[in-house]
């Protein structure tokens, strides 16, 4: 079935993350967050692994997350890293592998039995403890779409868009994620200007809606940079 | 055993849109790489775009940046590939299929284990 053949190990030759194989002709040498790159050769190994530049857990793949490859590193280089496995430390939900969530810093199994308790237990303590955080990162008070077995509704929370039902997304909201609306027409929407900047807001807005892309507003062009209003807009 | 199915797909003048959609089955969709490929006839099959897990990160073949749109809902087991500005040379059997999305990289065509049976786009001059 689909989920024992993405939960199992059976890819064992997995060509280079974005950024394509060295060597290997018409791959693309460099990636940009946002942006799939095609490259790499069907027989390399994930030995092989190039580091993918990410702003968000969201743009790594399922079994990886997003952050700044050294410790105590400059936030706004970070690379998609290998997931944690069981009993390793972590600083919040997406650094655990599919499976597993982050409980007072180490991995521990998702048993879907006390999840939900856990979570709940998990965001009162962060905001019951003056918004504290492990060694300097937000608890990602969140929980693997895997987990789910109804979509979140508006206000629910979440680890990524797919655990929200439709016409919502997984956004920031404090110090946790939780199902937001999708931006309709003409709603404010959040453009970032620079790589890692999604960090810096604690209340996120959601993605435009289909067919909708986030640009400047037409009479906002004479503004200054810093207060240029962006709003979502027909392609 | 997971099954897509495309759907949208049909005749229409160059300058104009169609809205292709690609349903799954199986639960675990969230967590795969959804891609379009394209094949014309005496032609080999071809990535067109594709969209990770979440929505985040897509590619788009250079022959159809600007004109078309993937995008997926999570929640209705759906890929979408909206085609604006279709050329005749855009004519061809398209087809979703879906892959792992363990590592943040774009899947060689090998990679994608499910494929659909393909819808037919005729783009007439």
């Known amino acids: 079935t689909l989920n024992s053949v993405l939960n199992s190990n059976a890819i064992k030759n997995l060509p280079p993350p974005l950024g394509g194989a060295a060597g290997h002709p018409g791959s693309a040498v460099s990636a940009a967050p946002g942006i799939l790159y095609p490259g790499g050769n069907k027989y390399q190994t994930i030995d092989n692994y190039q580091p993918y530049p990410c702003a968000e857990d969201e743009e790594c793949g399922t079994d990886e997350y997003c952050a700044s490859p050294t410790r105590g590193g400059d936030a706004g280089v970070q690379i998609c890293l290998a997931c944690r496995k069981r009993r390793k430390r972590c600083m919040r939900h997406a650094m655990c592998c599919p499976g597993n969530y982050c409980k007072n810093g180490i991995c521990v199994s998702s048993d879907q039995n006390h999840f939900r308790g856990e979570i709940e237990e998990t965001i009162t303590e962060s905001f019951g403890n003056d918004h504290s955080t492990l060694d300097g990162y937000s608890r990602r008070t969140t929980l693997s779409s895997k987990m789910y077995h109804t979509k979140g509704q508006e206000g629910s929370v979440c680890l990524r868009s797919s655990d929200c039902a439709s016409g919502l997304c997984c956004a920031r909201h404090f110090w946790s994620k939780i199902c937001k609306p999708v931006l309709k027409e003409g709603q404010v929407c959040t453009k970032h200007r620079r790589k890692g900047s999604h960090g810096l807001e604690i209340f996120q807005r959601c993605y435009c809606g289909e067919g909708l892309s986030c640009r400047i507003q037409k009479d906002h062009h004479q503004a200054s940079n810093s207060s240029r209003l962006h709003t979502c807009q027909r392609h | 055993e997971v099954q897509l199915v495309e759907s949208g797909g049909g005749l229409v003048q160059a300058g104009g849109s169609l809205r292709l959609s690609c349903t799954a089955s199986?639960?675990?969709?969230?967590?795969?790489?959804v891609g379009w490929f394209r094949q014309a006839p005496g032609k080999e099959r071809e990535l067109v775009t594709a969209i990770n897990w979440s929505g985040a990160r897509t590619y788009y073949a250079d022959s159809v940046k600007g004109r078309f749109t993937i995008s997926r809902d999570n929640a209705r087991n759906t890929a979408y590939l909206q085609m604006n500005s279709l050329k005749p040379e855009d004519t061809a059997v398209y087809y979703c299929?879906?892959?792992?999305?363990?590592?943040?990289?774009?899947?060689?065509?090998?990679?994608?284990?499910?494929w659909g049976q393909g819808t037919q786009v005729t783009v007439s001059s």
């Open positions: 199986g639960s675990a969709f969230s967590s795969t790489v």
């Open positions: 299929a879906a892959g792992s999305d363990r590592y943040a990289r774009v899947l060689t065509e090998y990679e994608y284990m499910w």
